[in-house]
């Protein structure tokens, strides 16, 4: 907290300019008018203030706007944004995408801070949903943003926004998140033809059900092993050897290297060894010939 002292003669700031970097903290407090600062916030970012000095400027704005800053000030905070606490940000009402971009730019190249997370949360809640432009902006600054949302939060993403999602944006998503995103992607890309559709839907397939994988196996998609390994185990298990062969195409040979890993391992255990042998890959662990497979889950459902 800077002590209240009178401004020395001739030092009263008439505008926000570079001369203020030579003011001591108490001089900034005494000689810079908060209203002047608020109207000339756009200049602050271009002036090489220390963070100690920015603390003083923040204090002045806090006194002027105890209920939270107006967006006209927020948009020009620049590096002063880094001095804000999540509590400060919760008082704001940020509605402009330009304001959001300006503040994210300040933190560019750094991991998401609590301030940024709070800002994004306030912005998205204010908009009511994660629209395409917002998602575009957020994933440009934070590729992992989408995967940081809960399935509940993801449910507010409209299918039209899915067009903004790049494969790398989904790298850290878990199956629960992909379960929510996949139906939206399916809806978003439904009017595309086979090969184009597969290119777009591929990164979302970790949320695909068995019937959709069966349908894809009829379309000569040649799914790569990396995508196959991210599929839901429960969706892969019911696939026949023939369907997996069609789904993977030339990549089917990669199953051998993955035979000890899920979902391949679990899928092998569900296949007849005879059928696995038709692949000629030397996959072992299937159901021996002559054994009868009873699906007890089906029996329980009927009784």
């Amino acid at each position: 907290e800077v002590e209240k002292t009178a401004c020395p003669s001739g030092k009263k700031a008439r505008e926000i300019d570079e001369s203020l970097i030579f003011y001591k903290k108490w001089e900034l407090e005494a000689c810079v008018d908060a209203a002047l600062l608020a109207t000339q916030m756009d200049r602050v970012n271009a002036i090489p203030f220390t963070y100690e000095q920015l603390d003083v400027l923040k204090h002045k704005l806090d006194e002027l706007y105890p209920q939270g800053y107006p967006e006209s000030v927020i948009q020009h905070l620049g590096y002063l944004f880094l001095k804000m606490s999540p509590e400060d940000i919760r008082k704001w009402n940020v509605t402009s995408l330009e304001t959001l971009k300006a503040l994210l730019e300040v933190n560019k190249g750094h991991e998401m801070s609590p301030q940024v997370a709070t800002l994004i949360d306030r912005f998205v809640k204010g908009r009511g949903q994660l629209d395409k432009d917002t998602l575009d902006t957020l994933t440009a600054f934070y590729p992992g943003y989408l995967c940081s949302l809960s399935p509940e939060e993801l449910s507010s993403v409209p299918p039209s926004s899915i067009w903004a999602v790049r494969p790398q944006d989904l790298d850290t998503c878990d199956p629960r998140q992909l379960d929510v995103l996949y139906p939206k992607a399916r809806l978003a890309f439904q009017n595309m033809n086979g090969s184009e559709y597969f290119v777009k839907i591929q990164s979302f397939l970790g949320g695909a059900p068995t019937e959709d994988l069966k349908a894809l196996s009829q379309q000569n998609v040649s799914m790569d092993l990396a995508t196959f390994m991210k599929l839901r185990t429960d969706a892969v298990l019911p696939l026949t050897v023939a369907e997996v062969q069609k789904l993977l195409g030339p990549h089917v040979e990669g199953l051998k290297a993955e035979e000890r890993h899920r979902p391949v391992r679990d899928w092998i255990l569900r296949q007849r060894q005879d059928d696995l042998d038709t692949l000629g890959l030397g996959l072992q662990g299937g159901i021996p010939n002559g054994y009868l497979v009873l699906d007890l889950s089906m029996q329980e459902a009927l009784s």
């Epitope: 090489p48 203030f49 963070y51």
Partner: nanobody
């Protein structure tokens, strides 16, 4: 984190010259601007000069025309060339880096101007 180590201080006669150096290490990519501050005995810390990443320089009125700030990016070093030194320039000189999201300071180097 950014680490700063100053050197080059010492005893010098009035009218003489000295060059201070400040070697920066650590997360130097996050540095926005750097500067030299000084604190004379019994006085407040004051800014002497600042230089931005694009090379824009600023000087306090009391050193204008006598001191020159510069940086060598290849050596990650900040300099302060001090000419026409006066007794009132006697102080501990501190190097400061303003980096994301705080200010980092060196331990200081003492400059004594005396005959």
């Amino acid at each position: 984190e950014v680490q700063l180590v100053e050197s080059g201080g010492g005893l010098i006669q009035p009218g003489g010259s000295l060059r201070l150096s400040c070697a920066a290490s650590g997360n130097i990519g996050s540095i926005r601007h750097m500067g030299w501050h000084r604190q004379a005995p019994g006085k407040e810390l004051e800014l002497v000069s600042t230089i931005t990443t694009v090379g824009t320089t600023y000087y306090a009125n009391f050193v204008k025309g006598r001191f020159t700030i510069s940086r060598d990016n290849s050596k990650n070093t900040l300099y302060l060339q001090m000419n026409s030194l006066r007794a009132e320039d006697t102080a501990v000189y501190y190097c400061r880096a303003t980096a994301h999201p705080t200010d980092y300071w060196g331990q200081g180097t003492l400059v004594t101007v005396s005959s």
